[in-house]
């Protein structure tokens, strides 16, 4: 009898592993092995596939034939007993083509109200992404145990830091990743759980902002208690981007080593240009609080993010603001080549009840003023990006006289 | 293979100074932390400070500040644990380890013993 | 400093029982913690880094778990090459600081 040749060959590459699979023709006739062979492109010979010649089962692995993942291949099967059968050919595919990313390797770190998350490629050295090391993205999914309320979070890097969650608490997770540029979304990892601990005695710093004066960078938070020492580290921030390395040489400012207030002051050139993160510590001489979040600074943007300059013209129920590019030392405007919002803030001379208006457009009006009535106002820039989500500080309050009644003209 | 090749064991007087070594190979120093820990015979491990060798940034617990001093030499993968005014507290054994992922002493030296004895 | 408490300096067991070696931190230090096993005569060898995360190569029988204050290195199935000291290690702050190490003893 002939052998029929072996049909619906599907070819499964997950990172660095190649396994093939097919359908057997003819279910009655035992005792039938499979063998493959696969030619390169360019190639009229066929070359016999190692790790699957002679296969009893309907699935073999062919991940240590060393291929170039980026060139094109063909494989052809057939079935063998005493004779064998015609060969059947698989379409051709590059393998990089054909790939999928496979689950991420998980390692998790618990605070009392913080879970850091190191994300690792699940193949080490892998050749079929070792030009995309650096390429890769992650999201993932997070729930509390209890309640399997879901939160995605997207784009992330082999190290990230979850923020602002309950103590004693279970949360678990699972992580997938991302080759964007080759439009490729992984498998996700396996489900992993951690216990966050009981609350520690000292909650670490918050509200950290970074502002520039002089030639200076000031760096304020908000501390719960007096009396403490504040310690302030900073991390290049490509450097969570790096894979597989997970250790993090943050770095001290020498300025903001145990300082006794809420803010430090340190030489802009302690940083060269780029992006970085900061945190802070607080400790009281016996216990440590655990880092603050970690703030994303952008020497660009901070450097020349400084306060609007703007004119007011008073009518007697409003003010008219224009707002002009800040001006540096030596009076040059500064060129701000990125969309930038406004945040005016406005109040009687005589009351403390600063109303706020928030506004794209360089000229703002101001309006629901009484007429012979001073008001101040003071404006900062916010960049409207997301990510850096930086500001300003405020400029000087400047205050005017709104004119008589009927005046509006 | 990552190892850490540590010098010989050092016989020296009381108020005197020494200065142990320690070699890696298998690895790049800078890509690394490199610590140092004291144990003395029958007592626990004591944590003297680190070295970030990209850097020389250095950090030292309290208690060794002023008498440790570590440094490194990137062009021949070493690191240096220099000790002064040696008193028999100091009679101990030093292990240099390697600082890696997830801030772990991954890998240790085999130890330098050091006797302070007039 | 952080000083992490090793309360039991010696542990008597035999091959084929479990044992647990705790150790008790003086602050919260998240699962920022080590275990590290020192066979005589040797230097010491990672074991659990991450509170709960079996090094490469260390047997299975080997398992960590605590967070916050308390630690517990437990040795399942304990074999007779696990003689040694074990040591329990906090990297949450600087300075590092160790246990005062627990000697295994095996009947």
């Known amino acids: 009898k002939n052998l029929k040749s072996p049909q619906k060959v599907e070819v499964d590459i997950i990172d660095d592993n190649f396994i093939l699979r097919w359908n057997r023709s003819d279910e009655s006739v035992g005792n039938v092995t499979f063998s493959f062979d696969y030619q390169k492109t360019g190639m009229d010979n066929w070359i016999k596939l190692s790790g699957c010649q002679n296969i009893t089962s309907t699935k073999c692995n062919f991940s240590s034939l060393k291929l170039n993942v980026y060139e094109e291949i063909k494989l052809r099967i057939r079935a063998e007993k005493e004779n064998t059968s015609s060969w059947y050919e698989v379409d051709s595919f590059t393998p990089f083509r054909k790939a999928q990313i496979g689950p991420p390797e998980v390692h998790l770190e618990a605070e009392d109200k913080a879970i850091v998350i190191h994300i690792s490629p699940g193949t080490k050295d892998s050749v079929m992404w070792a030009l995309d090391g650096l390429s890769f993205t992650y999201s993932l999914v997070i729930w509390k145990n209890s309640s399997g309320v879901e939160e995605r979070i997207e784009n992330i890097y082999s190290r990230h830091k979850i923020y602002k969650l309950s103590p004693e608490t279970t949360y678990c997770l699972k992580v997938k990743a991302a080759l964007l540029t080759s439009w490729k979304i992984g498998v996700y990892s396996p489900v992993h759980c951690i216990k966050t601990t009981v609350e520690n005695e000292l909650p670490p710093p918050e509200n950290i902002e970074v502002s520039v004066q002089n030639q200076n960078y000031v760096l304020k938070w908000d501390y719960t208690y007096a009396n403490m020492t504040f310690q302030v580290q900073w991390l290049h921030a490509f450097l969570k981007r790096n894979p597989g390395n997970h250790l993090y040489k943050w770095k001290q400012i020498p300025d903001c080593e145990n300082v006794k207030t809420t803010q430090c002051v340190f030489p802009q050139n302690v940083f060269q240009k780029g992006i970085y993160l900061l945190r802070v510590q607080a400790s009281d001489g016996n216990n440590t609080s655990f880092w603050s979040e970690e703030i994303k600074f952008d020497t660009e943007i901070q450097a020349f993010l400084l306060p609007p300059v703007f004119n007011i013209r008073s009518l007697s129920d409003s003010f008219h603001i224009y707002i002009g590019a800040p001006k540096q030392s030596g009076n040059t405007p500064v060129i701000q080549d990125y969309p930038l919002i406004y945040e005016i803030i406005f109040w009687e001379n005589t009351s403390n009840a600063e109303r706020k208006i928030i506004e794209k457009k360089t000229d703002v009006t101001v309006p629901n003023l009484k007429p012979l009535t001073v008001y101040c106002v003071k404006a900062r820039a916010h960049t409207m990006d997301e990510k850096l989500n930086k500001s300003s500080v405020f400029s000087d309050a400047v205050c005017e006289k709104t004119k008589p009644g009927n005046t509006s003209k | 293979e990552v190892q850490l090749l540590q010098s010989g064991a050092e016989l020296v007087k009381p108020g005197a100074s020494v200065r142990l070594s320690c070699t890696a190979s298998?690895?790049?120093?800078?890509?690394?932390?490199l610590h140092w820990v004291k144990q003395r015979t029958e007592q626990g491990l004591e944590w003297i400070g680190r070295?970030?060798?990209?850097?020389?940034?250095?950090k030292y617990a309290p208690k060794f500040q002023g008498k440790a001093t570590i440094t490194t030499d990137t062009s021949s993968n070493t690191a240096y644990l220099q000790l002064s005014s040696l008193t028999s507290e100091d009679t101990a054994v030093y292990y240099c380890?390697?600082?890696?992922?997830?801030?772990?002493?991954?890998?240790w030296g085999q130890g330098t013993s050091v006797t302070v004895s007039s | 400093d952080i000083v992490m408490t090793q309360s039991q300096k010696f542990m008597s067991t035999s091959v084929g029982d479990r044992v647990s070696v705790t150790c008790k931190a003086s602050?919260?230090?998240?699962?920022?913690v080590v275990w590290y096993q020192q066979k005589p005569g040797q230097s010491p060898k990672a074991l659990i880094y991450?509170?709960?995360y079996r090094y490469s190569g260390v047997p299975d029988r080997f398992t960590g778990s605590g967070s916050g204050t308390d630690f517990t290195l437990t040795i399942g199935n304990v074999q007779s090459e696990d003689l040694a000291e074990y040591f329990c290690?906090?990297?949450?702050?600087?300075?590092?600081?160790f246990g005062g190490g627990t000697k295994l003893e095996i009947e």
């Open positions: 298998g690895f790049n120093i800078k890509d690394y932390y």
């Open positions: 290690q906090q990297k949450n702050t600087y300075p590092f600081t």
């Open positions: 602050q919260n230090v998240g699962t920022y």
């Open positions: 991450s509170a709960s």
């Open positions: 070295i970030d060798p990209e850097d020389g940034e250095t």
């Open positions: 380890t390697r600082g890696g992922n997830y801030d772990v002493m991954d890998y």
